[in-house]
Interface confidence: medium
């Protein structure tokens, strides 16, 4: 199998980290979608996950962690606000869809917290601190009890992009699910 | 048919700051990516940077990362490009453009920069 | 960054000449490229998306092709209102990059 790829953020306590993972496929639009951390010879563990069906643009809090979901973008958006050492770790974002097994989307996200002065409220532009305010139809919304020891046997191509059109102007052959697109990150 | 409307042209002093806005008149923002392109006198197309105004957050070009700041306010369907120290060789045509990411019959993806502004021209002498 | 290059960098050709301009990405970038067209002190025109989808509106003289690293522009009968310069860009990975440009003049 092809090594999976990842890409390393690098923050300072409190700060928020803001991800954005690419579903790509129009059918996962209403799958519900998780969030995982992967811990050395252990299986990825659900930390938060999207309702089921996914509701577009509708916040999930679970703790520190906000999930929304874009259908209009295909691009479900992922925040750990208030940053601690301890939130180092492997983290990826997956598309639930049982009984198979969990879809793994865009490069897994090395993040690495350190401790140090981040400076004033907001005065970086990776971090919103905690002052960002969850609106007030956040909901908590329950995940699928089960892990998957393995999430896809393949790494998603870095930096590669499908172009079906809705009027098939272009043909596209060999698409798998698993095809990043480019969106600002 | 949406547009896209630049603030008017700037003169600026090395060392100084400048910010450019770009609204979306006759459409909103919704599924779109807002660009920032420059083209110095007699050059060609420079990919300053973007962002998604439903994401807060902007992606730069290398060289000009530190300098460069893009915002986009939702509310009021308007895009802003914030360059700062500026230099003689800043001066330049910025145009903003739009690129509209859009659901096919399987896929999303992505038109190119399918919508641009008219442009802005920003001079940085002393 | 990906290179993106261009050639020629300026072509003389007449009224109702078939016309060629080539883009080569130094790196595969699937059919994410896109081409431009510019007139004298105005904004760039979108022409073609996805290597080869012609954007709403652009005559169907105008043709895109290729796809990973190699890619055409084609005008198969130049009109008077085509002599411009012509950009590709590449939007498959940040930051997007374009190419140097070809000036298309009347012979």
């Known amino acids: 199998a092809t090594k999976l790829t990842e890409e390393k953020y690098e923050l300072k306590e409190g700060q928020t980290l803001d991800v954005k993972c690419d579903y790509t496929l129009e059918k996962f639009a209403s799958s519900q979608k998780a969030w995982q951390i992967i811990r050395d010879g252990e299986m990825p563990k659900t930390l938060a996950c999207t309702e089921r069906p996914s509701k577009n643009s509708h916040p999930v809090q679970v703790g520190r962690i906000i999930l929304e979901d874009y259908h209009d973008h295909g691009l479900l958006r992922v925040r750990m606000v208030n940053l601690q050492v301890e939130d180092s770790g492997l983290y990826q974002c997956v598309i639930y869809q049982p009984p198979k097994e969990p879809h793994m989307l865009f490069d897994r996200i090395r993040l690495v917290v350190t401790k140090g002065f981040s400076g004033t409220p907001g005065s970086n532009e990776n971090s919103t601190q905690n002052v960002y305010k969850i609106p007030p139809t956040t909901t908590k919304a329950l995940c699928p009890l089960y892990t998957s020891p393995r999430t896809v046997t393949q790494a998603p191509p870095k930096s590669t992009a499908d172009v079906s059109t809705p009027d098939s102007e272009i043909n596209l052959t060999n698409v798998t699910d698993i095809i990043r697109v480019p969106v600002f990150n | 048919q949406v547009q896209l409307v630049q603030s008017g042209a700037e003169v600026k002093k090395p060392g100084s700051s400048v910010k450019v806005s770009c609204k979306a008149s006759?459409?909103?923002?919704?599924?779109?990516?807002i660009s920032w392109v420059r083209q110095a006198p007699g050059q060609g197309l420079e990919w300053m940077g973007g962002i998604i105004p439903i994401f807060s957050t902007g992606n730069y070009a290398q060289k000009f990362q530190g300098r460069v700041t893009i915002t986009a306010d939702e509310s009021t369907n308007t895009a802003y490009m914030d360059l700062s120290s500026l230099r003689s060789e800043d001066t330049a045509v910025y145009y903003c453009a739009r690129s509209t990411r859009v659901r096919g019959v399987s896929h999303y993806y992505y038109y190119g920069l399918d919508v641009w502004g008219q442009g802005t021209t920003v001079t940085v002498s002393s | 960054d990906i290179q993106m290059t261009q050639s020629p960098t300026s072509l003389s050709a007449s009224v109702g000449d078939r016309v060629t301009i080539t883009c080569r990405a130094s790196q595969g970038i699937s059919s994410w490229l896109a081409w431009y067209q510019q007139k004298p002190e105005k904004a760039p025109k979108s022409l073609i998306y996805a290597a080869s989808s012609l954007q709403s509106g652009v005559p169907s003289r105008f043709s895109g092709s290729g796809s990973g690293t190699d890619f055409t522009l084609t005008i198969s009968s130049l009109q008077p209102e085509d002599f411009a310069t012509y950009y590709c860009?590449?939007?498959?990975?940040?930051?997007?990059?374009f190419g140097q440009g070809t000036k298309l003049e009347i012979k």
């Open positions: 860009q590449q939007y498959n990975s940040y930051p997007y990059t």
């Open positions: 006759g459409g909103t923002f919704s599924s779109s990516a």
